[in-house]
Amino acid sequence: VTGSRVYPANEVTLLDSRSVQGELGWIASPLEGGWEEVSIMDEKNTPIRTYQVCNVMEPSQNNWLRTDWITREGAQRVYIEIKFTLRDCNSLPGVMGTCKETFNLYYYESDNDKERFIRENQFVKIDTIAADESFTQVDIGDRIMKLNTEIRDVGPLSKKGFYLAFQDVGACIALVSVRVFYKKCPLTVRNLAQFPDTITGADTSSLVEVRGSCVNNSEE
């Protein structure tokens, strides 16, 4: 069950973790001691589900979190918007070389919407994600964390859907929101010709040819 959130008209949302009511129930590996689902409140006092991990004291961390299957709905390129907090290692006493300040984002294309396990070698790395500003002493409030936003895109996609995965290697992270969307060119009318909603191409600069039709009471 999802609640509605308002996004730009040219973006079609495939996944919005903040709109899910109840637990997200994504798959974590290991099952315990890694990523943990945590409920917090948004500014409207509505519960939102987040995932957090903070094993900064222990070396050799390899904690994975995988979303449910995401249908691509014909989109060849999708965008991933992540809102997260990330702890500055300098603010954590005694963590030395074990603390990291990045995490990794992966995807895996699949026609199977019910894969139960995380097979790390199937996933393709999208990018290493770092905070634009970690939250230690943001302004003067050391109990208030800056919410970072990073957007990445991936494509061309060809299978029915895909899974996203987040790999922690020893950082202190909270994933507050994950949104996956594709872009479309909205319905347009030019010179009495109507062009339908059209999903953008595989590349950001791709031109997609689309056939128009005459508006009512006009002829070709």
Partner: antibody, heavy 126, light 112 residues
């Protein structure tokens, strides 16, 4: 309705340690911060420190640094506060208190101590 | 560290009449996100404290609407529009912007 239930009163000798527990019933324990606040007889409230999950490690008031350890065991929904090298002026009621976590569009923080334990009286006397 | 100063120390009140408590911080509690990190608590005799107001002006769940919080930066006020007998106790303000969190010294509200 979430409740925080603390361990019973303690009488301790100077130089010893005390460990107070705070068990949550109801709600998701991992979803909120736990702070510890103490109140000496006839005095005001004093914040000792706390653990905010998405901040990572415990955060202690400088006054108690090196003497206090705060931990939590999410599997049994219990938080602990251990104070060592006790002195007579540590005689006080020790409270655990819950803080809800929230995120706005630009930042994350906490929403005040909305639920308190009943308090644990710790008496330090020779 | 932020220092919190409350006044008055003691406040004798008449039921049905309004009451006001002032709290001043040594540093601004207004964050760039627009929130004032100031909470108000009431500790009734023999009880644990209870949250009345968070983030300067937001009433906590179950708190009667006769309680209101106002102010910004360094100066804050808790108002009780019509005092009731059950409102007696010690009122504390607390800054929650940065560690160490700090409480005011308290204001004891008692019936005249």
């Amino acid at each position: 309705e979430v409740q925080l239930v603390q361990s019973g009163a303690e009488v301790k000798k100077p130089g010893s340690s005390v460990k107070v527990s705070c068990k949550a019933s109801g709600g998701t324990f991992s979803s909120y911060a736990i702070s510890w606040v103490r109140q000496a007889p006839g005095q005001g409230l004093e914040w000792m420190g706390g653990i905010i999950p998405i901040f990572g490690t415990a955060n202690y008031a400088q006054k108690f640094q090196g003497r206090v350890t705060m931990t939590r065991d999410t599997s049994i929904s219990t938080a602990y506060m251990e104070l060592s090298r006790l002195r007579s002026d540590d005689t006080a009621v020790y409270y655990c208190a819950r803080e809800l976590l929230y995120c706005s569009s630009t930042s994350c923080g906490t929403h005040g101590f909305d639920i308190w334990g009943q308090g644990t009286m710790v008496t330090v006397s020779s | 560290d932020v220092v919190m100063t409350q006044s008055p120390l003691s406040l004798p009140v008449t039921p049905g009449e309004p009451a006001s408590i002032s709290c001043r911080s040594s540093q601004s509690l207004l964050h760039s996100n627009g929130y004032n990190y100031l909470d108000w608590y009431l500790q009734k005799p023999g009880q644990s404290p209870q949250l009345l107001i968070y983030l300067g002006s937001n009433r906590a769940s179950g708190v009667p609407d006769r309680f209101s919080g106002s102010g910004s930066g360094t100066d804050f006020t808790l108002k009780i529009s019509r005092v009731e007998a059950e409102d007696v106790g010690v009122y504390y303000c607390m800054q929650a912007l940065q560690t160490p969190l700090a409480f005011g010294g308290g204001t004891k509200v008692e019936i005249k």
